[in-house]
Amino acid sequence: VEVQVSEDPVVALVDTDATLRCSFSPEPGFSLAQLNLIWQLTDTKQLVHSFTEGRDQGSAYSNRTALFPDLLVQGNASLRLQRVRVTDEGSYTCFVSIQDFDSAAVSLQVAAPYSKPSMTLEPNKDLRPGNMVTITCSSYQGYPEAEVFWKDGQGVPLTGNVTTSQMANERGLFDVHSVLRVVLGANGTYSCLVRNPVLQQDAHGSVTITGQPLTF
C-alpha cells in the first residue's frame, strides 16, 4: 500500500477547521475490516485518531478530529481537525496498514492575521521640531511572530532606535508592540507595517505630524 500526502504544509487559520489530506489506493475487493489507519503526532507518536479493527476508534486529541467515514473505502484517509489552535501546529503522520503498510507525514502551519495597528505618541501635545518623540505601533492577536517595518513619509526605512516586543497570550497568539524613537522634523509621516510571514498579510498604521493637531 502506498500512502500519499500533500508535500506543502497545510496552512490553517486559528479557530477554523483544517483538513490534513492523506490517501491510499485500495486493491479490488478491499474492505474496511482490513484497514488499520492511524494518525499520530510525528515526533512523539501520540495517537490523534484511528480506524482499526473495522471501526472508527475515535479522537484521542481533544475530541476535535474526525475522519471521512464514507470516503475511507475509496482510499481517502484524510483527517479533519476542528477549531484549530496554535498548539496544533506541527507534523502529523498518516499510517495505513492493510496487508503491508506505509506512512507519510504532513505539516500543519497555524496562522492568525494581525489587527490593524494602533498608533500612540508620547508626548502627544506641545510638539516642536527637534523634540524627541516616542511612537508606539501596536497590533494584536496574530500568529506566528510578526515582522515589523518602519518608514518615513518618503518610504525610507527607519531602522535605528526601534524596539519591538512580541508577547504570546494564553492562546499562543502574539501581541506586537514596536516603539520608534525619532527627532521631529518640521512635519512628517511615520508608518508602521506589521507583516504576518506565513499569510503574507500586511497590516498598516501611520501617524502624520504637522505641527498641531496630529492625524492618525
Epitope: 492511524i38 499520530q40 495517537l47 484511528s50 476508534q57 484521542a60 503522520t93
Partner: antibody, heavy 115, light 107 residues
Framework: QVQLQQPGAELVKPGASVKLSCKAS????????MHWVKQRPGQGLEWIGM????????NYNEKFKSKATLTVDKSSSTAYMQLSSLTSEDSAVYYC????????WGQGTTLTVSS | DIVMTQSQKFMSTSVGDRVSVTCKAS??????VAWYQQKPGQSPKALIY???YRYSGVPDRFTGSGSGTDFTLTISNVQSEDLAEYFC?????????FGGGTKLEIK
Amino acid sequence: QVQLQQPGAELVKPGASVKLSCKASGYTFTSYWMHWVKQRPGQGLEWIGMIHPNSGSTNYNEKFKSKATLTVDKSSSTAYMQLSSLTSEDSAVYYCARGGYFDYWGQGTTLTVSS
Amino acid sequence: DIVMTQSQKFMSTSVGDRVSVTCKASQNVGTNVAWYQQKPGQSPKALIYSASYRYSGVPDRFTGSGSGTDFTLTISNVQSEDLAEYFCQQYNSYPYTFGGGTKLEIK
C-alpha cells in the same frame, strides 16, 4: 489460539522502575492495539493506555502519563510497560489486553512495591 | 472523563434465577459498552461488546442491552459457575473507563 503471557509477579523497591512484559501469540501482533489495565486489590479496573505495535502510536490515560511508558518489540511479539518512581500506590495487578474490544486478557502480573 | 456507575456492589441470587446487573454512564456513550466477568483469582473475561453482542463461546444465558447512558447485563438461568464480579466498560471516548464492579453471590 490467542494467548497473552505475563510473568506472575514482580517485587521492586520504592523509587525504582520496573518493565512488565506481555508476550502475544496466536494472532497477528501488529494488527491489534495492546491495552494495559491496573487493578488494585479489592478495587476496580483502571485503563492505563494503549499502543499499536505496527505504528508505535500510543495513547495514555492522563493519570498515568508520567508513570507509564508503553513500548513493543515486533520481532518477539512482545508489549512492554515501564513504570517509574514506584510507590506503594503502584502495587497492583497489571493486565495486558488485546484490541479495541479487550477481547483477550493476559493472566496479569502482580507488582509489589516494598522495601 | 466518563464515569461508569454500577450502583449495586453485591447481588445475591440462586441457581436457576434470572439476575440483571446495571451500569449507568455519566454521558451518552452510544452502544460502545462492554461487559467483563472476573472470577476470583483470575483475569477478566470478555462477555459482551457493543452493548449487546456476545463473544463466541459465551453462553447465551448472558444478554447485554441498552444504549446511551443505561446498560444492563442479564444472566438468565444462573449457574454456580457464574459466581464472579462483573464490570462494565465504555470505549466511546478516551480515557476508557470501567464501572466499579458488581459481585454476584450464589445463595
